[in-house]
Interface confidence: low
């Protein structure tokens, strides 16, 4: 049965066998076509979401679709109900918190009382002023915590109390990419890990362990990616990946946060990478032990200039590495996540690509996570 | 995905065979079902048979029975369609089509005209 | 052999409008049913298939529905590109037979 199972899929009425290469190959096989249905799943970017949350205290804001401006969330009446709704319509499903905070001196959005109208955030008619003078502070999740703070030095074995949300992403049990877990559905990870095995059946996550043998793996429901877009063909390098049951959450299995839509981090900011990537470009081995780097974001205009990508780099990308070269993400650390601590820590960057590893001149390229804030919700809300 | 790239038009006199080749490209031949559909002028599709992925056994519309066969050269990745005892009514368009069940991947078509 | 019958033979109809063409087996097919685009000249493209799934870079304007005898395709909203035939394909049994054909004319 191992070894059907390992070379053959099973199609039913009526039963017969297939070859497994013939899973996802874009050729119905099977009579009603169960051998294309497990497969990697595009999903398009969808429409605006019509709430997203600011770097300022992760305050609420609403969009208003008929003018298309934004509009901050006063506290006035603000409920439990229109907390969650506001988390649903990004997609979320666990419990929110929310707190008023006090509007800023810096607040350049209209502040606006907020009803609910068809499980939407509206602003509400006639508005008044904010009377308590305070905004919504509300978070959908609890996310970006680590029992552990790692030190700032060069590269270093890494410990999952450091970095909980860090997974494997492992085909026929061979680790292939890191991920990072956002909520308990789901795992954020690049789009190009897939490219060679399309068939979910034989995707596994591993997750809690700084070790790549020694977690149990969980089973993959569905991966979803952007459409492909050929004008850019190294745009869009990211996947989502929802899992079978929803994990559990420990000290060593959490999520983390996704990044603010304002995130706008500015050159040299301090960042942090991990994973079991190769140790040697064009070498080494896979390694066995999880590390972890500091590293910083390297302005776009420098990592586009004619020494180093060329113009490669999209607005939907960042570059992060060292000046000096020496600490990058190679190859096995793919899909895993470029990170930046506030309060919380943040999945900012996805591993994406870049040539070489750890050249001075070319850095590592990073799918920009905020980028595609809308996209994730319209996934996550497809699938509520 | 799979190509498919069929053999050029024909012209035919009534009673003879033609035979229209497709070959596959872009993928495992050997685990190709090719199925054989027709379009006479200004008609719908008629489905006249399909030759299995291994072992090249073949299933056949009643309709056609005794007069069509189909047959594989592996080392070329082509599938052939023989149609024999033509007559007028035969005048189509015949397209191969990847799928023992549904068909996403379609030949170009082979129009083949029985004419005196 | 099962006869698929579908109706109606054609349609006019202007862009953004919805369509639906219905398709009836002859006897029971379960969700062994297909659908088919065909533009003049051009080979059939493979729309749905087993009754409802959208077949891989198919717009989801497209839909199909039904299980048993009764199958409908629905076009949410009509875009210039879906003026077109479509066929209906029953794959529960050899031979495999088809609709008639639906042509979808602009109005």
């Known amino acids: 049965k191992v070894i059907l199972d390992k070379y053959y899929f099973l199609c039913g009425q009526p039963l017969h066998f297939i070859p497994r290469k013939q899973l996802c190959d874009g050729e119905l096989d099977c009579p009603l076509g169960e051998d294309e249905e497990h497969c990697v799943k595009s999903f398009p970017e969808g429409p605006a979401v019509a709430v997203r949350l600011s770097k300022d205290r992760s305050t609420l804001q609403v969009l208003d679709s008929a003018t298309g401006n934004w509009f901050s969330a006063c506290f006035d009446n603000f409920t439990e109900a229109l907390a969650e709704t506001a988390c649903r319509q990004m997609g979320y499903s666990s419990k929110p918190t929310f707190r008023a905070v006090e509007i800023g001196p810096d607040q350049d959005l209209d502040v606006v009382e907020i009803t609910e109208n068809s499980q939407e955030l509206r602003m509400r008619n006639s508005s008044g002023p904010c009377l308590s003078g305070s905004l919504v502070s509300l978070h959908c999740l609890a996310c970006g915590k680590s029992l552990k703070t790692p030190r700032v030095v060069g590269v270093e074995e890494a410990s999952v109390d450091s970095w909980p949300w860090q997974v494997s992403i492992q085909y026929d049990k061979q680790h292939v990419c890191g991920g990072s877990i956002l909520d308990p559905h789901w795992v954020l990870t690049a789009a190009h890990c897939f490219r060679k095995h399309t068939d979910v059946f034989n995707w596994k996550v591993r997750a809690g362990s700084d070790k790549l043998g020694s977690f149990p793996s969980l089973a993959v429901a569905k991966i979803i990616i952007i459409e492909f877009n050929p004008m850019y063909p190294k745009d869009n390098d990211i996947a989502l990946m929802k899992l079978q049951f929803p994990l559990t959450f420990s000290g060593t299995v959490r999520p983390i946060c996704l990044p603010f839509f304002d995130e706008e981090l500015t050159p040299a900011t301090p960042l942090w990478i991990i994973g079991w990537g190769f140790t040697k470009q064009n070498g080494g081995k896979m390694s066995d032990i999880l590390l972890q780097a500091s590293v910083q974001v390297i302005d776009s205009t420098r990592c586009n200039a004619d020494d180093a990508y060329q113009g490669e780099v999209t607005e939907k990308m960042m570059c992060a590495g060292i000046p000096e070269g020496g600490v990058d993400t190679c190859q096995g650390d793919s899909g895993g996540p470029l990170m930046y601590q506030s309060d919380q820590w943040h999945v900012v960057g996805i591993v994406s690509w870049g040539y070489g590893c750890g050249g001075p001149s070319t850095p590592g390229v990073y799918t920009k996570v905020s980028a595609y804030l809308n996209w994730i919700y319209n996934v996550w809300k497809a699938e509520l | 995905q799979v190509q498919l790239v069929q053999s050029g038009a024909e012209v035919k006199k009534p009673g003879s065979s033609v035979k229209v080749s497709c070959k596959a490209s872009?993928?495992?031949?050997?685990?190709?079902?090719i199925s054989w559909v027709r379009q006479a002028p200004g008609q719908g599709l008629e489905w006249m048979g399909r030759?299995?992925?291994?072992?090249?056994?073949?299933s056949y519309a009643q309709k056609f029975q005794g007069r069509v066969t189909m047959t594989r050269d592996t080392s070329t990745s082509t599938v052939y369609m023989e149609l024999s005892s033509l007559r007028s009514e035969d005048t189509a368009v015949y397209y191969c089509?990847?799928?023992?069940?549904?068909?996403?991947?379609w030949g170009q078509g082979t129009l083949v005209t029985v004419s005196s | 052999d099962i006869q698929m019958t579908q109706s109606p033979s054609s349609l006019s109809a202007s862009v953004g409008d919805r369509v639906t063409i219905t398709c009836r087996a002859s006897?029971?097919?379960?969700?062994?049913l297909n659908w088919y685009q065909q533009k003049p000249g051009k080979a059939p493209k493979l729309l749905i298939y087993?009754?409802?799934s959208l077949q891989r870079g198919v717009p989801s304007r497209f839909s199909g529905s039904g299980s048993g005898t009764d199958f409908t395709l629905t076009i949410s909203s009509l875009q210039p590109e879906d003026f077109a035939t479509y066929y209906c394909?029953?794959?529960?049994?050899?031979?495999?037979?088809f609709g008639g054909g639906t042509k979808v004319e602009i109005k």
């Open positions: 089509a990847r799928g023992r069940y549904s068909s996403s991947s």
């Open positions: 872009g993928g495992t031949f050997s685990s190709y079902a």
């Open positions: 394909q029953q794959s529960y049994t050899t031979p495999l037979t």
């Open positions: 006897q029971s097919i379960s969700t062994y």
């Open positions: 087993a009754a409802s």
């Open positions: 030759i299995n992925p291994s072992g090249g056994s073949t």
